[in-house]
Amino acid sequence: ECGHISVSAPIVHLGDPITASCIIKQNCSHLDPEPQILWRLGAELQPGGRQQRLSDGTQESIITLPHLNHTQAFLSCALNWGNSLQILDQVELRAGYPPAIPHNLSCLMNLTTSSLICQWEPGPETHLPTSFTLKSFKSRGNCQTQGDSILDCVPKDGQSHCSIPRKHLLLYQNMGIWVQAENALGTSMSPQLCLDPMDVVKLEPPMLRTMDPSPEAAPPQAGCLQLSWEPWQPGLHINQKCELRHKPQRGEASWALVGPLPLEALQYELCGLLPATAYTLQIRCIRWPLPGHWSDWSPSLELRTTERAPTHHHHHHHH
């Protein structure tokens, strides 16, 4: 190779200056006794190269680009050879930003997959390859003292979430959890969460059902609906509170919320509704009185109220 480029830094902050030098070996000077070294950034010729012959006979050109405003570009040095440009060497330049502090880190415990799933917002685009690592440790107290470290959790490329499997979790004990972002320009860390995985448990919702009419039970009053729900079995031993929402199927009415309902109110009569109207109903639950996350809303149940106009409006439930 006749030429070689070296740069002050191949990766810089976007907008920062960069200095490069191109050296042509003496044994290449047959190309031209006094070769003029040219610089090109991408497709554009760059003026301002300062050229000199060194004591060993090699030629050197130094250029300073005052602002690298491209997130990625190739810088090349070349010689005029006949009517064409002969490229001697080229380097890839990258420019971007150090990672911002990841924010909005939150986690939930999924009892079905037996894993703690944490997600975060990575912040603005850095324009550079940036890796995220979910880091954690076990702690007996309030995470001021660090216990055993837990194996780093590395998300798949482009994802801003990661799952810590059960074997690395201690239930009913606190864990310190944070996200570390790293690229060629720096490292940043999110604020640390201190949590007991069970305090961020997200349950599955119960299954809503129509209450089977029994011969001895009174039929529902007009404007009332009778329904029941089947709790999610794996969460049965977790104290929960639930809430119901309903809206007429037709029209633009918004959801009306009813609750809190205890999980064990497995039968419910919902009154004060429009007569002879089809309603959509959903239910969701949360660990309570201990901390937790609301479940998703259950699949919808569609029921129709009876014809007669209601005589009065009220809510009540039967155990």
Epitope: L111, T112, S114, R166, K167, P234, E264, P289
Partner: antibody, heavy 118, light 107 residues
């Protein structure tokens, strides 16, 4: 410290009845599921029944369904098992257990022996 | 009902031995698997819950692993006080079935 103390066991004739009690202390009784597990002489453990924190959900083993009734009095921190139509095969040590949020029996009483024999 | 099958039903081992007991569920139970230790004339004691969580006060030589249908209780270095009968139990749904038990005896 969690303590569970069973009482009410004894000798009863086939077809007879017995009521077991379990007095709980050292934890907030009204927040936890409770249960009964039994162990026939020389045999393994057999789950009998459980009851939810407020008493609204009461699953039973098929072997006792319709004959045994589990209940609780949260004001007295006491769990009960009413056993009717007792059979010889109900002879066992009956343990009261506090259940954790994942269904585990996290604390056990010392057990009370029920003998059904003529 | 979910059936629980434990193996072996008994084993002989020496102090310091590594002991492994397995438990298989007839259908998937996620991680809802608990292990208990029972000594003669005593009430059972919870060792491991949710497949791998050590109950407070239980020595760290006890560990649990597995998920779905196959689970393992391991005692890394058997101590004299560990000679007992061990039971697994599923708690994902009712009826909560126990395994048949594994008696660990002195060789």
């Amino acid at each position: 410290e969690v303590q569970l103390l069973e009482s009410g066991g004894g000798l009863v004739q086939p077809g007879g009845s017995l009521r077991l009690s379990c007095a709980a202390s050292g934890f907030t009784f009204s927040l936890y599921w409770m249960g009964w597990v039994r162990q026939a002489p020389g045999k393994g453990l057999e789950w009998v029944s459980s009851i939810s924190s407020s008493g609204g959900v009461t699953p039973y083993a098929d072997s006792v369904k319709g004959r045994f009734t589990i209940s609780r009095d949260n004001s007295k921190n006491t769990l009960y098992l009413q056993m009717n139509s007792l059979r010889a095969e109900d002879t066992a040590v009956y343990y009261c257990a506090k259940l954790g949020e994942l269904g585990q029996s996290s604390a056990w009483g010392q057990g009370t022996l029920v003998t059904v024999s003529s | 009902d979910i059936q629980m099958t434990q193996s072996p039903s008994s084993l002989s081992a020496s102090v310091g031995d590594r002991v492994t007991i397995t438990c298989r569920a007839s259908q998937g139970i996620s991680s809802y698997l608990n292990w208990y230790q029972q000594k003669p004339g005593k009430a059972p004691k919870l060792l491991i819950y949710y497949a791998s969580n050590l109950q407070n006060g239980v020595p760290s030589r006890f560990s649990g692993s597995g998920s779905g249908t196959d689970f393992t209780l391991t005692i890394s270095s058997l101590q004299p006080e560990d000679f007992a009968t061990y039971y697994c139990q599923q708690s994902i749904q009712y009826p909560q079935m126990f395994g048949g038990g594994t008696k660990v005896e002195i060789k």
